[in-house]
Interface confidence: low
Amino acid sequence: VPDKTVRWCAVSEHEATKCQSFRDHMKSVIPSDGPSVACVKKASYLDCIRAIAANEADAVTLDAGLVYDAYLAPNNLKPVVAEFYGSKEDPQTFYYAVAVVKKDSGFQMNQLRGKKSCHTGLGRSAGWNIPIGLLYCDLPEPRKPLEKAVANFFSGSCAPCADGTDFPQLCQLCPGCGCSTLNQYFGYSGAFKCLKDGAGDVAFVKHSTIFENLANKADRDQYELLCLDNTRKPVDEYKDCHLAQVPSHTVVARSMGGKEDLIWELLNQAQEHFGKDKSKEFQLFSSPHGKDLLFKDSAHGFLKVPPRMDAKMYLGYEYVTAIRNLREGTCPEAPTDECKPVKWCALSHHERLKCDEWSVNSVGKIECVSAETTEDCIAKIMNGEADAMSLDGGFVYIAGKCGLVPVLAENYNKSDNCEDTPEAGYFAIAVVKKSASDLTWDNLKGKKSCHTAVGRTAGWNIPMGLLYNKINHCRFDEFFSEGCAPGSKKDSSLCKLCMGSGLNLCEPNNKEGYYGYTGAFRCLVEKGDVAFVKHQTVPQNTGGKNPDPWAKNLNEKDYELLCLDGTRKPVEEYANCHLARAPNHAVVTRKDKEACVHKILRQQQHLFGSNVTDCSGNFCLFRSETKDLLFRDDTVCLAKLHDRNTYEKYLGEEYVKAVGNLRKCSTSSLLEACTFRRP
């Protein structure tokens, strides 16, 4: 019989008392085969973290700073359940730390030196740890003691709770450094008042502070937020302009064997029976003998943290950077305006080989990081382990939802000013063998399908989006008799046609022979009835253009396109017979790396782009014998995006809507994790 006990860690007598009450009340409402609570008492949160790591306890609820400690080796804990605030319909699990300024003050984030600052309090998250952590490497040396470095960075501050004797500059803007509401500039509202009164130039608070203090929108309009990319935005746009997104209060557990499903089952049942306004005799979110015992008193319920989400992703790149800077206190030798090498994310073995060759040729401008799937690469870019990669539109959507931005677009047509003219896109098509003359768009049910990969544009999002509108369900593996859609569940009929061996079968990378455009076409040639690819795929792999044994004798005339009106047309008539226009592949990165990735890639394509005529003796960035490694092989150049610099603008409203509709069918664990952080 599996042990269904969750050992909750309590950090005080009062918490232990509430935990026992929690245990007893859960016993009275949950059947004997359901989850149960046991209580473990420790002296501090850090002791609880160690106890969970050592398998002496299973769960504890922590503030963001402690979630970071819990994640660090050797603890290796992960977030499993989040408390939420506000309503069930619009649950708030995060708040945003922001830098608020007056509208006409005319400076940016990188010009804060010498300004006057308003803080909620020394050592507090939004008011001190996050802004000072992010500014850490800009502080004058020596950076220890930290308060002295901050005092020398700003021309005056109000930082309640600071030592006014040792660091008078930190209390210069407020009447003393009082650490309570008696100090009119203490806390969120106080720090904002310090700005509003004109004492300071910038206030470090949380996003809701300005709404709580200014009911009138016309008044709020006189303030702006400083963004990390050295721009400003209106205060409403805090989701796109903040210093960090911070989880409020989170249950953590072991990463391996951590009982996360059991913990969720327990807490979900607990909130049903003892949540807000549920029970008189025991309340989960109430602390008669103290404050915030086990859970925050202000919490309204729990949400399950998506399993794909580790602590780094949950806390977010900015927060982790800020806290790491404060804790470790390490900075690059001397801050320079020079760009650091761009860490390119390479998928599996083949891409890594090409990337290493690029790295050598780039003389230190490009470094390589490996991952097994596109989603793993996106996650690495999010958390700073990698910086950039080129993605199909479907993954640009996921990357965008995860906070990444497109920076350059692949262009596939030769033109005089290729780099200045991003193209409208390519065509997603459905290809069949000419010999299968009875096959049309309207009778695909029960046929064998070939897809580039799940989540990709031409191979999945467009055809499956159109199909979804017809069949109104997500059971595509029932619709087709079998197929190869790399990235599907291994036991799905959509992995049955795939050719990868062993663990590589149906993997969404080049170890699966039927992966990508060329792979999907090969799947059609050898096994399938229909392939969903781009309009250039057939000509690129027929007429001897692909020397591989399976392709070298293929003839374009032996294939036809399925049109949405139920007719068929020759391959060259793709402009009048396609499923939809697809956005070109694009390079994505983090916002903070945008300028450097742009600069370095433009240099690299001038050195190794399509102007290199002999690829046998020289490194060519856009060539890989039809395998589309790192970039599509038909890329002519990487083009500037001009104002299409967000994933929505880049992909276009129609495509974003199509993928949005298909999200009901999404199996993307990363998308689930990212929409948890930003619904």
């Epitope: 506000g86 309503s87 619009d90 708030q92 509208k103 006409d104 996003h207 809701s208 709404f211 709580e212 009911a215 009138n216 929108k217 016309a218 008044d219 709020r220 309009d221 006189q222 209106p234 409403d236 746009e237 805090y238 619904p679």
Partner: antibody
Framework: EVQLQESGPDLVKPSQSLSLTCTVT?????????WHWIRQFPENKLEWLGY???????NYSPSLKSRFSITRDTSKNQFFLQLNSVTTEDTATYYC?????????????WGQGTTVTVSS | DIELTQSPSSLAVSVGEKVTMTCKSS????????????LAWYQQKPGQSPKLLIY???TRESGVPDRFTGSGSGTDFTLTISSVKAEDLSVYYC?????????FGSGTKLEIK
């Protein structure tokens, strides 16, 4: 295209509560902007009632604050008006509308309005 | 609350004529920091909801024909229709969003002779 559509009862008795729904299509009410209720009396006078911001923050006209509230259901992309203890003076056409970030309170999208009569 | 007085309350003109209507505010709607006037104009055709024409006193909303012009500053504002068309038959309202709560004028009804 952003569209707003009001719905609710045509007739309400005095002292009862009035509940109206605004259903928004083409834009998520949590993604940005403020979402307002405005009414127009039979003699054509327009009166602003209040808004709910995409963040969930609300703001009401001082003259109605005590008996008026706005809530929302983000899963259905709807926001609601509740006006308690209605009198015949509350007979009007009720509109929902959206404003821009810039300028605030200048309503760029309106519903077609729903007419409510308060009468016994 | 800020009061807005519109005049005339109604006027009748022939197609092709120029029309001017005014909106007076009980206090200045000019915000000195950004030099913007927090005033909007709306058009309401019979049986329809109001439609935003002008904001910041003089900025035309996209899609609004250029025969509609907003002008003025501080407390006195004007909406001009340079050459009236039959479809302009409407009530025109001004609205201030300088100060909470936002308020509307009582409207000017434009009739076609």
């Amino acid at each position: 295209e952003v569209q707003l559509q009001e719905s609710g009862p045509d007739l309400v008795k005095p002292s009862q509560s009035l509940s109206l729904t605004c259903t928004v299509t083409g834009y998520s009410i949590t993604s940005g902007y403020s979402w307002h209720w405005i009414r127009q009396f039979p003699e054509n006078k327009l009166e602003w009632l209040g808004y709910i911001h995409s963040s969930g923050a609300t703001n009401y006209s001082p003259s109605l604050k005590s008996r008026f509230s706005i809530t929302r259901d983000t899963s259905k992309n709807q926001f609601f008006l509740q006006l308690n203890s209605v009198t015949t003076e509350d007979t009007a056409t009720y509109y929902c509308a959206r404003d821009g970030y810039s300028p605030p309170y200048a309503m760029d999208y309106w519903g077609q309005g729903t007419t409510v009569t308060v009468s016994s | 609350d800020i009061e807005l007085t519109q005049s005339p309350s109604s006027l009748a003109v022939s197609v092709g004529e120029k029309v001017t209507m005014t909106c007076k505010s009980s206090q200045s709607l000019l915000y000195s920091t950004n030099q913007k006037n927090y005033l909007a104009w709306y058009q309401q055709k019979p049986g329809q909801s109001p439609k935003l024409l002008i904001y910041w006193a003089s900025t035309r909303e996209s899609g609004v024909p250029d025969r509609f012009t907003g002008s003025g500053s501080g407390t006195d504002f004007t909406l001009t229709i340079s050459s009236v068309k039959a479809e302009d038959l409407s009530v025109y309202y001004c609205q201030q969003y300088y100060s909470y709560p936002p308020t509307f004028g009582s409207g000017t009804k434009l009739e076609i002779k």
